[in-house]
């Protein structure tokens, strides 16, 4: 039976949401010894490297100079070592931003809170959009996906410290393709806790609201900043 | 309908203790924050603090922070605040108030008043 | 703290005529900025949410406008159960803060 080699990694600089008109590098990370990558986009051939010397090499990037709504979409790759292919990357989902129109995001009660209060944040855009997406800055992303017809509600429900932090939304015009992001929102979560059965850095979000809670595993692999790339995207699976 | 029955009134004397409790019904207590605002005869408002019943999380004026001490009781719903080391100042109506992104429903107040 | 000052302190206005009251954040708060209404002897009551979104039960008279450090109420016509004072308060940052409030009589 024919083995294949282990995946790759596959992720993009700075980052995978990359506004309009503007640089990405998609890197893909294999083995020493590869004679060739292959990225592929939308299940197709888009690219191929082969480095130079294969045996003190074990990444390949390519480079897309000018953004756009053609180049948005889901990224693998594969790598040979002589004839033998890896496994595929996962999925890498570069999403082009700054289309359109600019959302506004607002939190409620207030951006400063008492720890346990219920808080919930709405990001508005007015151009025809259904969904909406609520991000948190950091090296765990949260990604909260939320629909409406003009606003989407995302409640966080009670929240602890762990929640402190700026957050910003953008509306969706198809998976890959995303509004400005709104101007950021910092949350303050204050308050002395007597008697919690919440732990303070353990956010617990409501199974049916939050899409994934997302922190990576190939954290050794990767970059501090290649980190939300490699997690966060997972939302759009 | 939301109500919040506050208790009644107390005459206190300087550098004694004080504790006014507030009992909630028509909602569920442990899903708002309460707070407590505090009213001198023929002045503003003044916010004092507020807790979170579900875990407990207190958040404190500063000008109060060591004097005041806001406690609540899920299986009453009734939220207390305790005011020690009264001063003739301290003379005023204090209000529980629900934060439901405003403070929309309000107790009907408790006038303490301090006086030697 | 946010300081939040409200002007004028004292507005006398005739019945079914128009009042304005302002209310001035020290910094920007947004439309975190909540109104209340308080008549002699009882607590205050909510009449406008964020700056400018109406409360259920609240005649629709009443209305807010505003956004950053400037904000306003406004009761179109003035019906005689509306002399009263009115607070501001600030929603975006503990501590929470009021406005020293604004007396509306009757002129």
């Known amino acids: 039976q024919q083995q294949t080699l282990p995946k790759p990694f596959i992720w993009a600089e700075p980052h995978f949401m990359v506004p309009k008109e503007k640089q990405v590098t998609i890197c893909c990370q294999g083995n020493y010894g590869a004679v060739e990558y292959q990225l592929h986009f939308e299940g197709s051939l888009f690219a191929v490297d082969r480095p130079k010397p294969p045996e003190r090499i074990n990444k390949v990037q390519f480079y897309i100079p000018d953004m756009n709504s053609r180049m948005a979409g889901q990224y693998s790759c594969i790598y040979r070592v002589g004839e033998l292919w890896s496994e595929p990357s996962n999925l890498l989902d570069l999403v082009v931003t700054e289309m359109y129109d600019t959302p506004t995001l607002s939190v409620h009660p207030g951006p400063e809170v008492i720890s346990g209060e219920k808080v919930t944040f709405y990001c508005r855009l007015d151009t025809a959009t259904s969904m909406f997406l609520l991000l948190k800055e950091g090296r765990s992303s949260h990604v909260q996906r939320g629909y409406g017809k003009v606003q989407a509600e995302f409640p966080l429900g009670p929240v602890t410290t762990a929640h402190r932090g700026t957050y910003r939304c953008f509306g969706s015009y198809n998976n890959h393709a995303w509004s400005f992001p709104s101007e950021p929102v910092k949350l303050l979560v204050t308050g002395d806790i007597e008697n919690t059965s919440l732990a303070p850095e353990d956010p617990t979000f409501p199974a049916d609201t939050w899409g994934t809670y997302l922190l990576t595993t190939e954290t050794g692999l990767q970059k501090d900043h290649a980190l939300w790339d490699h997690t966060a995207q997972n939302l759009l699976r | 309908q939301v109500q919040l029955v506050q208790s009644g009134a107390e005459v206190k004397k300087p550098g004694s203790s004080v504790k006014v409790s507030c009992k909630a019904s028509?909602?569920?207590?442990?899903?708002?924050?309460m707070h407590w605002v505090r009213q001198a005869p023929g002045q503003g408002l003044e916010w004092i603090g507020g807790?979170?019943?579900?875990?407990?999380?207190?958040s404190y004026n500063q000008k109060f922070k060591g004097r005041a001490t806001i406690t609540a009781d899920k299986s009453t719903s009734t939220a207390y605040m305790e005011l020690s080391s009264l001063r003739s100042e301290d003379t005023a109506v204090y209000y529980c108030a629900r934060r439901g992104g405003s403070f929309d429903y309000w107790g009907q107040g408790t006038t303490v008043t301090v006086s030697s | 703290e946010i300081v939040m000052t409200q002007s004028p302190a004292t507005l006398s206005v005739s019945p079914g005529e128009r009042a304005t009251l302002s209310c001035r954040a020290s910094?920007?708060?947004?439309?975190?900025l909540h109104w209340y209404q308080q008549k002699p002897g009882q607590a205050p009551r909510l009449l406008i949410k964020?700056?400018?979104q109406s409360i259920s039960g609240i005649p629709a008279r009443f209305s807010g406008s505003g956004s950053g450090t400037d904000f306003t109420l406004t009761i179109s016509s003035l019906e005689p159960e509306d002399f009263a004072v009115y607070y501001c308060?600030?929603?975006?940052?503990?501590?929470?803060?009021f406005g020293q409030g604004t007396k509306l009589e009757i002129k």
């Open positions: 308060q600030n929603g975006h940052s503990f501590p929470l803060t």
């Open positions: 028509g909602y569920t207590f442990s899903e708002y924050t």
């Open positions: 910094q920007s708060i947004s439309d975190y």
């Open positions: 807790i979170s019943p579900n875990i407990g999380g207190t």
């Open positions: 964020y700056a400018s």
